[in-house]
Interface confidence: low
C-alpha cells in the first residue's frame, strides 16, 4: 500500500492531560492538537492509536501529512476537515483502522491539495456516493486525489446495509466523474464478487489497480481497453477460472501493463486453451511460471505453461459450480 509516510525527525507532543481538543479560534501556527504529535519541519501530524472519536478541530495549518490511524471515529461528517483558513497544504491523509463505518457526502471537501487518501481497514457500511466528489451534480469539480487506498473496507456481514457492497463503492468512485485524475486505486480484500465495468472505463488515468484477495470469478464484462496508462493490475487470490480471448487481447494491447494472477483456481479444460497459448507468448504476466490448475481434479497442480492442447479437454463436463463464467 502507498500510505503516506513521514520523514519527521522531531515531534512535539501536546500535554497528555488535555481533553480532546475543541477550539473555536484559529490555531496558533505551532499549536499541536491534544493527543497528537506534530512536526512542523516535516509538515506532519500524527494522532495515532489515541481512540479519538472525532477529527481534531485545531489541526495546524501547515499540515501536509496527517495520520489519524487506530482511532474510533465512527462517522466522517460533511466538511470533517473544513477549516478557516483551510488546510490548504494537506496532501496525504491516512484514516486506516479508525473504525469508520460511515463516510458522508462532502467529507473531504475544502482540501484543495489532497492527493493521497487511505481509508483501509474501516468497516464502511455506509459510503456516500458523494464522499469523494462532494457534490450530487452529474459532473462535479475534479478531485485532486491521485491515490485512493480502500483495502479491506468491507464491513462484517451483520453490519452491511441491505445493498450491494460493490455497487456502493463503485457509486462513490464514479459520482460526478470527480476522480478522473486518479492514478492508484487499491480495492484489495473486499469480497468483491464482480468488477463493475464502469469503474475502469471512467477512471482513464489509472496506473495501478489492486483487486487482489477478492472473490472475482470472471472478467467477462470488464474492459481494459481505455486504460492505456495502466502499469500494474493485481488480481492475485481471487476466484478466477479462466481469462477469455477478449480480455487477453485487451491486456496484451496495454503498453506498460504488468499483470499478477497468482493463487487463482484456474480450470484447465478446453476453455483454457487460448489462455495457455497466450501465457506462453506474453511478457505481461508476472510470475506466470507459478500459475497452476485447480480443476479438474486430474489436472490439479499442473503448471499452466507446461500444458498443451491435448491436456485441455471438456470431457467429462465439470459440475455447474466449476464451469467457466
Amino acid at each position: 500500500s502507498s500510505s503516506p509516510t513521514s520523514s519527521a525527525s522531531s515531534f512535539s507532543s501536546s500535554a497528555p492531560f488535555l481533553a480532546s481538543a475543541v477550539s473555536a479560534q484559529p490555531p496558533l501556527p505551532d499549536q499541536c492538537p491534544a493527543l497528537c504529535e506534530c512536526s512542523e519541519a516535516a509538515r506532519t501530524v500524527k494522532c495515532v492509536n489515541r481512540n479519538l472519536t472525532e477529527v481534531p478541530t485545531d489541526l495546524p495549518a501547515y499540515v501536509r501529512n496527517l495520520f489519524l490511524t487506530g482511532n474510533q471515529l465512527a462517522v466522517l461528517p460533511a466538511g470533517a476537515f473544513a477549516r478557516r483558513p483551510p488546510l490548504a497544504e494537506l496532501a496525504a491523509l491516512n484514516l486506516s483502522g479508525s473504525r469508520l463505518d460511515e463516510v458522508r457526502a462532502g467529507a473531504f471537501e475544502h482540501l484543495p491539495s489532497l492527493r493521497q487518501l487511505d481509508l483501509s481497514h474501516n468497516p464502511l457500511a455506509d459510503l456516500s456516493p458523494f464522499a469523494f466528489s462532494g457534490s450530487n451534480a452529474s459532473v462535479s469539480a475534479p478531485s485532486p486525489l491521485v491515490e485512493l487506498i480502500l483495502n479491506h473496507i468491507v464491513p462484517p456481514e451483520d453490519e452491511r446495509q441491505n445493498r450491494s457492497f460493490e455497487g456502493m463503492v463503485v457509486a462513490a468512485l464514479l459520482a460526478g466523474r470527480a476522480l478522473q485524475g486518479l492514478r492508484r486505486l487499491e480495492l484489495a480484500s473486499n469480497h468483491f464478487l464482480y468488477l463493475p465495468r464502469d469503474v475502469l472505463a471512467q477512471l482513464p488515468s489509472l496506473r495501478h489497480l489492486d483487486l487482489s484477495n477478492n472473490s472475482l470469478v470472471s472478467l467477462t464484462y470488464v474492459s481494459f481497453r481505455n486504460l492505456t496508462h495502466l502499469e500494474s493490475l493485481h488480481l492475485e487470490d481471487n476466484a478466477l477460472k479462466v481469462l477469455h480471448n477478449g480480455t487477453l487481447a485487451e491486456l496484451q494491447g496495454l503498453p506498460h501493463i504488468r499483470v499478477f494472477l497468482d493463487n487463482n483456481p484456474w480450470v484447465c479444460d478446453c476453455h483454457m486453451a487460448d489462455m495457455v497459448t497466450w501465457l506462453k507468448e506474453t511478457e505481461v504476466v508476472q510470475g506466470k511460471d507459478r500459475l497452476t490448475c485447480a480443476y479438474p481434479e486430474k489436472m490439479r497442480n499442473r503448471v499452466l505453461l507446461e500444458l498443451n492442447s491435448a491436456d485441455l479437454d471438456c470431457d467429462p463436463i465439470l459440475p455447474p459450480s466449476l464451469q467457466t463464467s
Epitope: R163, S164, G167
Partner: antibody, heavy 117, light 108 residues
Framework: QVQLVQSGAEVKKPGASVKVSCKAS????????ISWVRQAPGQGLEWMGE????????YYNEKFKGRVTMTRDTSISTAYMELSRLRSDDTAVYYC??????????WGQGTLVTVSS | EIVLTQSPATLSLSPGERATLSCTAS???????LHWYQQKPGLAPRLLIY???NLASGIPDRFSGSGSGTDFTLTISRLEPEDFAVYYC?????????FGGGTKVEIK
C-alpha cells in the same frame, strides 16, 4: 415508505419487444441494486439480471444476454427492463426487486406480459 | 450455475404443526448469501429470512433458518393460517443468481 411501482400488463406478439418500468420511491434510488425476476404461470422464480443505478453497472443472466436490456433514469428514480424477440415461453409476470447481498427486501407488484399470436 | 433443490415439493400440514423445509445447493453457498421468500397466489414474493438465519423486518419469530455449505433449512415452528403459501430459497453467491423450485405448504 419504500415502494416499487411497475407499469401495467402488456400483450405482445411473438418477435416483438416489451419494456417494463419500475418506479422507486421512499429511498435513495442510486444506493440500492435493482434486480429483475420473472415467473412463468405456475412456475418458480427466475433471475434475469441486475442494475446498479448509482454507477449503471449491469449484470445479465447469460440465458437472456442479447435479448434483455436494463436501463435506468436516475432523474425520475426509474429502472427499465426491455426484452426483445419475444417468444410464447416469455409469457410471465416480471418483477423488479430492490436489494442484493441481503436478499430482495422490496418487490414491485409485478407486470404480466403475455406473448400470443 | 448453482442449482437449488427444494424438498419436499409439497408439504401438507395442519395449523399449529411444525414445518421443516429443505434447500440443497449443487455446490457450496456462502451462508451470508442464502435467503428465503414466501409467496402467496397473485402476490409478489416477500423476504422472510436473509443470510440463512436472520429474520427480515416484520417477520414473526415463528420463522427461523439454519444451515451452511450446501444444506439449508427453513422452519416454521407453529403454522398459522396465513403461513400456507409457497416458499423459495435463493442464492446470491454466484452469478447467475438462482432460486429453488419452491415448496408449497398446504392445509391438510
Amino acid at each position: 415508505q419504500v415502494q416499487l411501482v411497475q407499469s401495467g400488463a402488456e400483450v405482445k406478439k411473438p418477435g416483438a419487444s416489451v419494456k417494463v418500468s419500475c418506479k422507486a420511491s421512499g429511498y435513495t434510488f442510486t444506493d440500492y441494486v435493482i434486480s429483475w425476476v420473472r415467473q412463468a404461470p405456475g412456475q418458480g422464480l427466475e433471475w434475469m439480471g441486475e442494475i446498479y443505478p448509482g454507477s449503471n453497472s449491469i449484470y445479465y443472466n447469460e440465458k437472456f444476454k442479447g435479448r434483455v436490456t436494463m436501463t435506468r433514469d436516475t432523474s425520475i428514480s426509474t429502472a427499465y427492463m426491455e426484452l426483445s424477440r419475444l417468444r410464447s415461453d416469455d409469457t410471465a409476470v416480471y418483477y423488479c426487486a430492490r436489494g442484493g447481498n441481503y436478499g430482495f427486501d422490496y418487490w414491485g407488484q409485478g407486470t404480466l406480459v403475455t406473448v400470443s399470436s | 450455475e448453482i442449482v437449488l433443490t427444494q424438498s419436499p415439493a409439497t408439504l401438507s400440514l395442519s395449523p399449529g404443526e411444525r414445518a421443516t423445509l429443505s434447500c440443497t445447493a449443487s455446490s457450496s453457498v456462502n451462508s451470508n448469501y442464502l435467503h428465503w421468500y414466501q409467496q402467496k397466489p397473485g402476490l409478489a414474493p416477500r423476504l422472510l429470512i436473509y443470510s440463512t438465519s436472520n429474520l427480515a423486518s416484520g417477520i414473526p419469530d415463528r420463522f427461523s433458518g439454519s444451515g451452511s455449505g450446501t444444506d439449508f433449512t427453513l422452519t416454521i415452528s407453529r403454522l398459522e393460517p396465513e403461513d400456507f403459501a409457497v416458499y423459495y430459497c435463493h442464492q446470491y453467491h454466484r452469478s447467475p443468481l438462482t432460486f429453488g423450485g419452491g415448496t408449497k405448504v398446504e392445509i391438510k
